[in-house]
C-alpha cells in the first residue's frame, strides 16, 4: 500500500496499524489520507513535536499499551479533524498544559490506565466538544474545582480506580448533559450535599467500592433520570428515609457489601422499573412491615448473608411480582405463618443456613407456584403435616443438615418424602439426629416400627430455572451431610475492564450442585 511504513499495516479503508516492540518512535512516513491510526504494544516512550503533522485528515488515533511517559505539548498539532484520541494503558504521569489545544472536533478522550497524579482546569479547557472522558485507573487524589467546567457537552465521565478521598460539591456543576458518571474504586468517605444536583440527565452513577459511610438525604433528589445506581461495597450503615424517593426511572440498585443495620418502611421510594435488588452481605437484623412495598415490579430480592432474626408479617407486602427470594445465611429462628402470603408468584425461596426450629403449617399457603425450597442447615426437627401438599410444581426441596427427630411423629413427613423422593435431589439426603440409636440414618428409609404402605414414586416436574448454585465443589453449601459450616464472606475479584464489583463466590444464592434449573 502506497506510503505505508514497513512496521505498519495499512488498509484501503485508510486505516493504519503499527504494532510491535521493535517500534521505538512514531513510524514515518504515514499515509497522508489515513483516517485511523493505531500504535499499539510498542516501545515508544515519548511523543515529540508534531509527529502527525502530515495526516491532518485523521479522525481516530489510538496510542495504547506502550511505554509512553512523556508528551510534548505540540504533539497533536494539526489534528483538527480528530474525534477520538486514546492514550490509555501507557505510563503518563503528567499531561502538559495545551496538549489538546486545537483538537476542536475531539469527542472521545481516553486517558485511562496511566499514572496521572493530577489534572487541572487548563488541561481540558479547549475541549468544548468532548462527549466522553476516561480517566479511570490513574493516581488522581483530588479533582480541582473548574476541571470540567468547559466540558458542557460531556455525556460520559469515568474517574474510577483512582485515589480520590473527597469530591468538591462544585466539580460537576456544569455537566448538565452528563449521562454516565463513574467514581468506583476510590477512597471517598462521603459525598457532599449538592454534588450531583446539576446532573439532571444522569442515567448511571457508579459509587461502588469506596469507603462511603453516610449518604446525604437529598443526594440524588435532582437525578430524576437515574437508571443505574451502584453503592455496593461501601461502609453505608444507614439510609436516610428519603434518599431514594425521587428515582422513578431506577432499574438497577446495588447495596450489597455495606454495613446496613436496618431498612425503614418505604425506604425504596417508588421505583416501578426496579426488577432486582441485591442486599446481601450487610448487617440487617430485622425487616419491618412494608419495607419493600413500593417495589411492585421486583422479581429478584437477595437478602442473604445478613443477621436477620425477625421478619415482620407484612415485610414483603407489595412484592406481588417477586419470583426469587434469598434469605439464606441469616439468624432466623421463627417465621410468621403469613410472612410469604403476599408472594403469590414466588418460584424459588432459599432459607438455608438459618436457625429455624419449626415452620408454621401455613407458611407456604398462598405460594402455590413454588418450585424450589432450600431449608438445609437449620434446626428443624419435624415439619407440619401437609406443609408441601398443595405445591404441585415443587420439584426441588432441600432438607438435609437438620436435626430430624425420628420418633413416631416423623412418620407423616417420612411418608411424604418417600412419595416425593426425586424432589430431594441425589446429592445429600436428610438424616435422623435423634433418638441416638438411629442417628445418621436416612430419614427416608428409617424404620420407626410402624408399617408404611407401599408407595409409588410419581414423576416430578422438570427442574425449574432455580437460583444460583455453586458450580465448583469448594463452597460451604456443597459440603457433606454432617457439615454445618457457616458461609464466609466472598472473595472479591476486581477486574480492570469492568465497573462493577465481581465476586468469585457463587454462594450469595447458596444453592447446591443438584440445583441446576
Amino acid at each position: 500500500y502506497h506510503g505505508c511504513p514497513s512496521e505498519c499495516t495499512c488498509s484501503r479503508a485508510s486505516q493504519v496499524e503499527c504494532t510491535g516492540a521493535r517500534i521505538v518512535a512514531v513510524p514515518t512516513p504515514l499515509p497522508w489520507n489515513a483516517m485511523s491510526l493505531q500504535i499499539l504494544n510498542t516501545h515508544i516512550t515519548e511523543l515529540n513535536e508534531s509527529p502527525f503533522l502530515n495526516i491532518s485528515a485523521l479522525i481516530a488515533l489510538r496510542i495504547e499499551k506502550n511505554e509512553l511517559s512523556r508528551i510534548t505539548p505540540g504533539a497533536f498539532r494539526n489534528l483538527g479533524s480528530l474525534r477520538y484520541l486514546s492514550l490509555a494503558n501507557n505510563k503518563l504521569q503528567v499531561l502538559p498544559i495545551g496538549l489538546f489545544q486545537g483538537l476542536d472536533s475531539l469527542e472521545s478522550l481516553l486517558l485511562s490506565s496511566n499514572q496521572l497524579l493530577q489534572i487541572q482546569p487548563a488541561h481540558f479547557s479547549q475541549c468544548s466538544n468532548l462527549k466522553e472522558l476516561q480517566l479511570h485507573g490513574n493516581h488522581l487524589e483530588y479533582i480541582p474545582d473548574g476541571a470540567f467546567d468547559h466540558l458542557v457537552g460531556l455525556t460520559k465521565l469515568n474517574l474510577g480506580k483512582n485515589s480520590l478521598t473527597h469530591i468538591s460539591p462544585r466539580v460537576f456543576q456544569h455537566l448538565g448533559n452528563l449521562q454516565v458518571l463513574r467514581l468506583y474504586e476510590n477512597r471517598l468517605t462521603d459525598i457532599p450535599m449538592g454534588t450531583f444536583d446539576g446532573l439532571v440527565n444522569l442515567q448511571e452513577l457508579a459509587l461502588q467500592q469506596n469507603q462511603i459511610g453516610l449518604l446525604s438525604p437529598g443526594l440524588f433528589h435532582n437525578n430524576h433520570n437515574l437508571q443505574r445506581l451502584y453503592l455496593s461495597n461501601n461502609h453505608i450503615s444507614q439510609l436516610p428515609p428519603s434518599v431514594f424517593m425521587q428515582l422513578p426511572q431506577l432499574n438497577r440498585l446495588t447495596l450489597f457489601g455495606n454495613s446496613l443495620k436496618e431498612l425503614s418502611p418505604g425506604i425504596f421510594g417508588p421505583m416501578p422499573n426496579l426488577r432486582e435488588l441485591w442486599l446481601y452481605d450487610n448487617h440487617i437484623s430485622s425487616l419491618p412491615d412494608n419495607v419493600f412495598s413500593n417495589l411492585r415490579q421486583l422479581q429478584v430480592l437477595i437478602l442473604s448473608r445478613n443477621q436477620i432474626s425477625f421478619i415482620s408479617p407484612g415485610a414483603f407486602n407489595g412484592l406481588t411480582e417477586l419470583r426469587e427470594l434469598s434469605l439464606h445465611t441469616n439468624a432466623l429462628q421463627d417465621l410468621d405463618g403469613n410472612v410469604f402470603r403476599m408472594l403469590a408468584n414466588l418460584q424459588n425461596i432459599s432459607l438455608q443456613n438459618n436457625r429455624l426450629r419449626q415452620l408454621p403449617g401455613n407458611i407456604f399457603a398462598n405460594v402455590n407456584g413454588l418450585m424450589a425450597i432450600q431449608l438445609q442447615n437449620n434446626q428443624l426437627e419435624n415439619l407440619p403435616l401437609g406443609i408441601f401438599d398443595h405445591l404441585g410444581k415443587l420439584c426441588e426441596l432441600r432438607l438435609y443438615d437438620n436435626p430430624w427427630r425420628c420418633d413416631s411423629d416423623i412418620l407423616p413427613l417420612r411418608n411424604w418424602l418417600l412419595l416425593n423422593q426425586p424432589r430431594l435431589g441425589t446429592d445429600t439426603v436428610p438424616v435422623c439426629f435423634s433418638p441416638a440409636n438411629v442417628r445418621g440414618q436416612s430419614l427416608i428409609i428409617i424404620n420407626v416400627n410402624v408399617a408404611v404402605p407401599s408407595v409409588h414414586v410419581p414423576e416430578v416436574p422438570s427442574y425449574p430455572e432455580t437460583p444460583w448454585y455453586p458450580d465448583t465443589p469448594s463452597y460451604p453449601d456443597t459440603t457433606s451431610v454432617s457439615s454445618t459450616t457457616e458461609l464466609t464472606s466472598p472473595v472479591e475479584d476486581y477486574t480492570d475492564l469492568t465497573t462493577i464489583q465481581v465476586t468469585d463466590d457463587r454462594s450469595v444464592w447458596g444453592m447446591t450442585q443438584a440445583q441446576s434449573g
Epitope: R228, N251, R252, R275, E276, R296, Q297, Q299, V300, T320, E321, R323, E324, A344, N345, Q347, M371, S462, Y463, P464, E465, P467, W468, Y469, D471, T495, L497, T498, T499, I500, V502, T503, D504, D505, R506, V508, W509, G517
Partner: antibody, heavy 119, light 110 residues
C-alpha cells in the same frame, strides 16, 4: 454500540469438546445476564442456560446440564460455552445473547457460531 | 416445561396487509403486572432480533407496525401493514419458567 462477537465455526469429532466464545463490548459486561441458545439445522430455538458475570452464577436448562458449561472471563469481557461429549445431534448454530434482568427478553444477540459434529 | 404452540406454521400476506401470529402456552405466564412473553424475528443467516418484550412493550428501534397483545395463555403478534423487509420467521418465547420458544411462524409475501 452494543456488540456480542462470537468465535468462528468449528468442525468436531464425536466424543470431543468445543468451547465457543462470546466477546462483549459497548456495555458494562458484569451488569447483564448472558444467555446461550441452540438452533439445530432447520429447527427452532432452544435455551441452554445463562450466566451472570456479576457473581459468576449460572442457571441451566436441565436438558443441557452436564452437556454445556457456561463461564465468563470478566477481565476480557468474554463469555464461554463449552460443550462436551459431542454427538451428531449437537450440530447446530449456537448463539449468545444479552438480557438486562434475569427474566427479561434477550435484547442483543451474537452472530452465531456453527458447530458441526461429524466423523 | 411450558409448551408454546405457534400458529400458523407459515403465513402468506400481501404487501401492506395485516399479518397475525398466535402463540398459545400450556399454562399461564402472566401476573397482574407482567406477561413473561417475548417475540423475536429471525431472517435467514441472521440471529434472532427482539421485537416485543413482556407481551406488548415494543423494543426501541422496532417499527410501530409491530404490536403484541394477550395475557395468560394466549398471545398475538400483529404486523399492521406488511413490508418486504418483514419476511422472516417469528418466534415467541416465555421466561416464566425454564425458557422455551415456540416452533416459529414463517411469514412470506403473497
Amino acid at each position: 454500540e452494543v456488540q456480542l462477537v462470537q468465535s468462528g465455526a468449528e468442525v468436531k469429532k464425536p466424543g470431543s469438546s468445543v468451547k465457543v466464545s462470546c466477546k462483549a463490548s459497548g456495555f458494562t459486561f458484569t451488569d447483564y445476564y448472558i444467555h446461550w441458545v441452540k438452533q439445530a439445522p432447520g429447527q427452532g430455538l432452544e435455551w441452554i442456560g445463562l450466566v451472570y458475570p456479576y457473581i459468576g452464577g449460572t442457571n441451566y436448562n436441565q436438558k443441557f446440564k452436564g452437556k454445556a458449561t457456561l463461564t465468563v472471563d470478566t477481565s476480557t469481557t468474554t463469555a464461554y460455552m463449552e460443550m462436551s461429549s459431542l454427538r451428531s445431534e449437537d450440530t447446530a448454530v449456537y448463539y449468545c445473547a444479552r438480557g438486562d434482568n434475569k427474566y427479561d427478553a434477550m435484547d442483543y444477540w451474537g452472530q452465531g457460531t456453527t458447530v458441526t459434529v461429524s466423523s | 416445561d411450558i409448551v408454546l404452540t405457534q400458529s400458523p406454521d407459515s403465513l402468506a400476506v400481501s404487501l401492506g396487509e395485516r399479518a397475525t401470529i398466535n402463540c398459545r402456552h400450556s399454562q399461564s405466564v402472566s401476573t397482574s403486572s407482567y406477561s413473561y412473553m417475548h417475540w423475536y424475528q429471525q431472517k435467514p443467516g441472521q440471529p434472532p432480533k427482539l421485537l416485543i418484550k413482556y407481551a406488548s412493550s415494543l423494543e426501541s428501534g422496532v417499527p410501530d407496525r409491530f404490536s403484541g397483545s394477550g395475557s395468560g395463555t394466549d398471545f398475538t403478534l400483529t404486523i399492521s401493514s406488511l413490508q418486504a423487509e418483514d419476511v422472516a420467521v417469528y418466534y415467541c418465547e416465555q421466561s416464566w419458567e425454564i425458557r422455551t420458544f415456540g416452533g416459529g411462524t414463517k411469514v412470506e409475501i403473497k
